[in-house]
């Protein structure tokens, strides 16, 4: 890989120096290193009107570097870049900068948004949420037993959160009345949610109002047939054998 | 918008002489390295040689070196190839790009026979 | 020179399916690298450079990643036009390596 060198080939200095430092392979007093040693880059930083040669290890933020057979070079990356592939594609702005397709831009372009922790334009990403999971087992008060009327939720997951300017996710928690067919509750029976359960179809009459809701959650207030309810199982003494219950699917 | 436009290119016995030429718009041409890359009839890409901004040095491939010679004016944005003793085997299609690490911008090429 | 081992050399595959195809080089070269796609009768085009930065213009559907000595540029999911030849690069040093080609035909 030699190099042919044309009329414009450098000239060594007047005052070329053998002791050179930091590196160099050859240098001058007024232009410091001309040439590197092995493996390292050779970079022009200008000093006022003067131009100095260094040699470094690798190049320093702001430029890019090229091994050419006889010579590793560092070049200047554009003036609003930090780090760069070559001239044309810049991998890291400068403060105050997005970096979009090897660019650096103040704003990022209609369609994309800027993120501050990489300094990088992206694309905006919407919430995506799961299907909904089947409804719960109709409970009150974490049983499912003793009631007629209850509760019944369902969740949903949110598969990609959205990012700045995305849209929002939709409540992943919805819950609903349910009537069910009363059930005594056996002698230490807890009833609690999650267990799996027959569903029967709608009973003629019973119906169910579905409620969204972003915390999943019910008025915490008590209602007429919550206390009729807790009397009942309070006085309550013999429990008859359990019955399955019958949750009402209709939907208003 | 840059355009490379390379002409030159024909039929020309072993061992005779071609030049190929280059014009350069679009892009600061005296910014940039300028290379050729060549590809023979259903081959890969094979790099010829490169000459850097300023014309004061240049790099050749070892199946050309020796034999090609690459120049250029920065005054009319324009890259040659100089191609003596020309053989079958440089029988190619030849593209004009620039060349900063990557072959940035390419041009449609000129299609050099090499037959007796 | 730095050795450019590309793989595979032809490939067939459908529209919409996904591809990858892998270029192993002969010494660590960092990020210093880059996919080109060529069309029949065409100029070779700059895909992604540094590895895995896409040129402007280029769909999302290509991606490249890789470090090192294994790189890799994947089609995420075909369109007509992306039936073409690719190549790989080292832009590591002089003097710069391509690897063989890998051709993506229609099956």
């Known amino acids: 890989q030699n190099a042919s060198r044309g009329r414009r080939q450098r000239r060594m200095h007047p005052n070329v120096s053998q002791g050179c430092q930091g590196g160099c392979a050859t240098c001058s007093d007024y232009n410091g290193c001309l040439s590197c040693k092995p493996r390292l880059f050779f970079v022009l930083e200008r000093i006022g009107m003067k131009q100095i040669g260094v040699c470094l290890s690798s190049c320093p933020s702001g430029y890019y570097g090229t091994r050419y057979p006889d010579i590793n070079k560092c070049t200047k990356c554009k003036a609003d870049c930090d780090t760069c592939f070559n001239k044309n594609f810049c991998t890291k702005c400068k403060s105050g900068f997005y970096l979009h397709l090897g660019k650096c831009l103040d704003n990022c372009p209609e369609g994309l948004e800027a993120n501050n922790h990489t300094m990088e334009c992206v694309n905006i990403v919407h919430c995506e949420v799961s299907e909904w999971n089947p409804w719960s087992p109709c409970t009150k008060k974490g049983k499912t037993c003793g009631f007629k009327r209850g509760t019944e939720t369902r969740v949903r997951e949110i598969m990609q959160h959205p990012s700045a300017k995305g849209n929002l996710c939709p409540p992943t928690n919805e819950t609903r009345k349910c009537t069910v067919q009363r059930k005594k509750c056996q002698k230490g029976e807890r009833g609690k949610k999650g267990r799996e359960r027959k569903r029967k179809k709608p009973n003629k009459g019973e119906s169910k109002e579905a409620i969204p809701d972003s915390k999943g959650l019910e008025s915490s207030k008590e209602t007429p047939e919550q206390r009729e309810n807790k009397q009942q199982q309070k006085k309550r003494k013999v429990q008859d054998k359990q019955q399955k219950s019958v949750s009402v699917s209709t939907v208003h | 918008e840059v355009q490379l436009v390379e002409s030159g290119g024909g039929v020309v016995q072993p061992g005779r002489s071609l030049r190929l030429s280059c014009a350069a718009s679009?892009?600061?041409?005296?910014?940039?390295?300028m290379a050729w890359v060549r590809q023979a009839p259903g081959k890969g890409l094979e790099w010829v040689a490169t000459i850097i901004y300023d014309g004061s040095r240049a790099y050749f491939g070892d199946s050309v070196r020796g034999r090609f010679t690459i120049s250029r004016d920065n005054s009319k944005n324009t890259l040659y190839l100089q191609m003596n003793s020309l053989r079958a085997e440089d029988t190619a299609v030849y593209y004009c790009?620039?060349?900063?690490?990557?072959?940035?911008?390419w041009g449609q090429g000129t299609m050099v026979t090499v037959s007796s | 020179d730095i050795q450019m081992t590309q793989s595979p050399s032809s490939l067939s595959a459908s529209v919409g399916d996904r591809v990858t195809i892998t270029c192993l080089v002969s010494e660590d070269i960092s990020n210093d690298f880059v996919w080109y796609q060529q069309k029949p009768g065409k100029a070779p085009k700059l895909l992604i450079y540094a590895a895995s930065r896409l040129q402007d213009g280029v769909p999302s559907r290509f991606s490249g990643s890789g470090s090192g000595t294994d790189f890799t540029l994947t089609i995420s999911s075909l369109q007509p036009e992306d039936f073409a030849t690719y190549y790989c690069q080292q832009s590591y040093k002089y003097p710069p390596t391509f690897g063989q080609g890998t051709k993506l035909e229609i099956k």
């Open positions: 679009g892009f600061t041409f005296s910014d940039y390295d």
């Open positions: 790009t620039a060349h900063d690490r990557s072959f940035d911008y």
